[in-house]
């Protein structure tokens, strides 16, 4: 969480942003809140990006003002106009690209004063893994698949019964480039699996960590998946 304060002249107002990560090809949110004002026409929101000449987005006098918007953001940004009055300056970003990563500034002017806060935005690809029993294999084998990751993640297997065991010798992980030539499909195979055990396939890069669990017993198979974004901190 980053909390910024305004400077000289008018009073300062508190602006708060949250560092976040965008999944390339999907929509992202750059979060920013501020002390609200009672009049929408008195609120100015400017989003800027370090190293970019034009504005990312501007909202003032109750409407979007995009004549100074940078070319890389054309047609890709929107504020939640109906929520500006309650202090929400968050920005929606369409079709996140790798190049959208960087430091953004949320700059606010209201009748109470000015304020700004920076936001670190990471971009990459992350997806939920699915673990299945590979019935085509000669021995009991598990197959962990996740369709989209970038940068290339690490894959680690773990088991509830053999806690602390190193499965690198009995597993094989491959990365297959997807059609858009950026993200990759992750496939990891674990051999010599025993029943009545819970196995976890953990995929991690510097943006996200995802886990796919599978519990194999003689009577049933139970699965569970979980994905967590790393380094989400507020300013």
């Amino acid at each position: 969480l980053i909390i910024g304060f305004g400077i000289s002249g008018r009073h300062s107002i508190t602006v708060t942003t949250v560092a976040s990560a965008g999944n390339i090809g999907e929509d992202g949110i750059l979060s920013c809140t501020f002390e609200p004002d009672i009049k929408l026409s008195d609120i100015v929101i400017q989003w800027l990006k370090e190293g970019v000449l034009g504005l990312v987005h501007e909202f003032k006098e109750g409407k979007d003002e995009l004549s100074e918007q940078d070319e890389m953001f054309r047609g890709r940004t929107a504020v939640f106009a109906d929520q500006v009055i309650v202090g929400n300056a968050s920005l929606r970003l369409k079709n996140v690209q790798l190049t959208d990563a960087g430091t953004y500034k949320c700059y606010i002017i209201t009748s109470k004063g000015k304020g700004n806060a920076n936001l670190e935005y990471k971009t990459g690809a992350f997806s939920m893994p699915e673990v299945n029993v590979d019935y085509n294999a000669s021995s009991e084998t598990l197959r962990c698949e996740a369709p989209r990751w970038f940068p290339q993640p690490t894959v680690v297997w773990a088991s509830q019964v053999d806690q602390g065991a190193n499965f690198s010798e009995v597993s094989n992980t491959s990365f297959e480039l997807n059609s858009e030539n950026v993200t990759m499909k992750v496939v990891s195979v674990l051999y010599n699996v025993t029943i009545n055990n819970t196995y976890s396939c953990m995929i991690e890069n510097d943006i996200a960590k995802a886990t796919g669990d599978i519990k194999v017993t003689e009577s049933e198979i139970k699965r569970r998946s979980h994905l967590q974004l790393l380094n989400s901190k507020a300013s």
């Epitope: 409407k63 979007d64 003002e65 004549s67």
Partner: antibody, heavy 119, light 107 residues
Amino acid sequence: QIQLKESGPGLVQPSQSLSITCTVSGFSLTSYGVHWVRQSPGKGLEWLGVIWSGGYTDYNSAFISRLSISKDNSKSQVFFKMNSLQADDTAIYYCARDITTIVEGFAYWGQGTLVTVSA
Amino acid sequence: IIVMTQSPKSMSMSVGERITLNCKASENVGTYVSWYQQKPEQSPKLLIYGASNRYTGVPDHFTGSGSATDFTLTISSVQAEDLADYHCGQTYSYPFTFGSGTKLEIK
């Protein structure tokens, strides 16, 4: 309220150029992009291009060599020019505006101007 | 170029019937699909945007659903005034593209 209105020549000679003006009201061209879409007789809709608030343009690659879109913010007018027209360019030409600043759907359309390419 | 394939090309329905129009994208377009109704001699009218959001003033018997590559427009109870062509379009990536349309006729 929000309105867009196209004005065009109606008839264009083969190999000649087409100029259409879209005059908008109820919103500012510095807030929203304006798109151009055409519809050939009995056919589907075809997106041709857009001019964004900042003046940047994006064109359908099939038309990039003969299409130009410009605007005058102060007059609330968008100008569409297509060169080297042939018979299969006969269509209704529409200007349209998106529902938000992110293109999610064309909520506002002009009435369209029918352009016939014929000698 | 993302190709939007609409099916069926045309359909004839009785008033009160439920119908589903389909639109398939050749690549993932997220939820950037919109649906339009076009009556004879009129401009297209936006019905659904963002795959499932009903536009202001659109009757609630129109419903959109889907994501990625498969999208549907459902008319829960067809009215005589629903006689029109229906187009889907994607605004996920350039060039934006539309399907070839479905003509809805009333029996």
